[in-house]
Amino acid sequence: KIDTPQRGSIQDINHRVWVLQDQTLIAVPRKDRMSPVTIALISCRHVETLEKDRGNPIYLGLNGLNLCLMCAKVGDQPTLQLKEKDIMDLYNQPEPVKSFLFYHSQSGRNSTFESVAFPGWFIAVSSEGGCPLILTQELGKANTTDFGLTMLF
């Protein structure tokens, strides 16, 4: 059983990378002297208590920054937020912390990240770029939900 987070880099199909700006993740075109975030991810250890065939349930954080991605409702709208949280603290909890979990599905080189707390809502970036990461139900329209995840070993 892997009980340390794996590290990875993410870009979307338009070759935009994730950058941390004022405690918000945004997707921007890769440029010189830019510091894309390194993702930390770890599978939930209570996988048997979650839905099967939806993907691998993972906690997603920013490597070395004690920040994790989570989903919460603002009004009636599920939103993507960054919270100060140790990813291993989430991993070790006695139950899945669903607000911080995502079903990671891979199809070829493409990865999607579906909220466990809000099924049908996916991490996305606006096709325009330079915008914050969001959650969307609208697949393949104005938002990009397919990402390339490259593991760093």
Epitope: E51, D89, N92, P94
Partner: antibody
Framework: EVQLQQSGAELVKPGASVKLSCTAS????????MYWVKQRPEQGLEWIGR????????RYDPKFQGKATLTADTSSNTAFLQLSSLTSEDTAVYYC??????????????WGRGTTLTVSS | QAVVTQESALTTSPGETVTLTCRSS?????????ANWVQEKPDHLFTGLIG???NRAPGVPARFSGSLIGDKAALTITGAQTEDEAIYFC?????????FGGGTKLTVL
């Protein structure tokens, strides 16, 4: 206001089955885990198991595997505990409780007032 | 299966500090046991106090605190009040299941 309303007392015969209910108000059971706990007279608490009402997955204490069945109906915001092949050992008060994550940990934050089950011929 | 042991009864006075403990038959209690503490008052009135060893549940008075003392989980009430008279149960996680202790009857005289 968050409340867990449990069904009324039951008197049942040995060998029978019973289904106890726990109806939540003030929150959606799909957003949390629902736990069931047994308390016998002059004894401590025993964890029976839990259900994730959003997807129906369950966990049981090994002692209650086969004895207890946990289900939930999200449309009525209700969790259920079914006990089968009842014996006098099942005479107890049964509680439902919400086990919720807030900030940095899981807590038993709200409890029902219990359902008294008496098994007697 | 693990057995969780608590003091059967303790007595304290208003304003005093009292510590209740929770021992595991499998060895030292650690943060991996995610100790929970629950209060039971008459007429089946339960309230969750502590989760994850030392995290107070929302709305719980600051006089209640959880910790590890030696090889046990502990609940400390700093400045006990008469309304704290109750039975206190601890519960410890062992992998995928939860085990409750027998409870401590706290009297505040």
């Amino acid at each position: 206001e968050v409340q867990l309303q449990q069904s009324g007392a039951e008197l049942v015969k040995p060998g029978a089955s019973v289904k106890l209910s726990c109806t939540a108000s003030g929150f959606n059971i799909k957003d949390t885990y629902m736990y069931w706990v047994k308390q016998r007279p002059e004894q401590g608490l025993e964890w029976i198991g839990r259900i994730d009402p959003a997807i129906g997955t369950t966990r049981y204490d090994p002692k209650f595997q086969g004895k207890a069945t946990l289900t939930a109906d999200t449309s009525s915001n209700t969790a259920f505990l079914q006990l089968s092949s009842l014996t006098s050992e099942d005479t107890a008060v049964y509680y439902c409780a919400r086990y919720d994550y807030s900030g940095s940990s899981f807590y038993f934050d709200y409890w029902g007032r219990g359902t008294t089950l008496t098994v007697s011929s | 299966q693990a057995v969780v042991t608590q003091e059967s009864a303790l007595t304290t006075s208003p304003g005093e500090t009292v510590t209740l403990t929770c021992r595991s038959s499998t060895g030292a209690v650690t943060t991996s046991n995610y100790a929970n503490w629950v209060q039971e008052k008459p007429d089946h009135l339960f309230t969750g106090l502590i989760g994850g060893t030392n995290n107070r549940a929302p709305g719980v008075p600051a006089r209640f605190s959880g910790s590890l003392i030696g090889d046990k989980a502990a609940l400390t009430i700093t400045g006990a009040q008469t309304e704290d008279e109750a039975i206190y149960f601890c519960a410890l996680w062992y992998s995928n299941h939860l085990v409750f202790g027998g409870g401590t009857k706290l009297t505040v005289l």
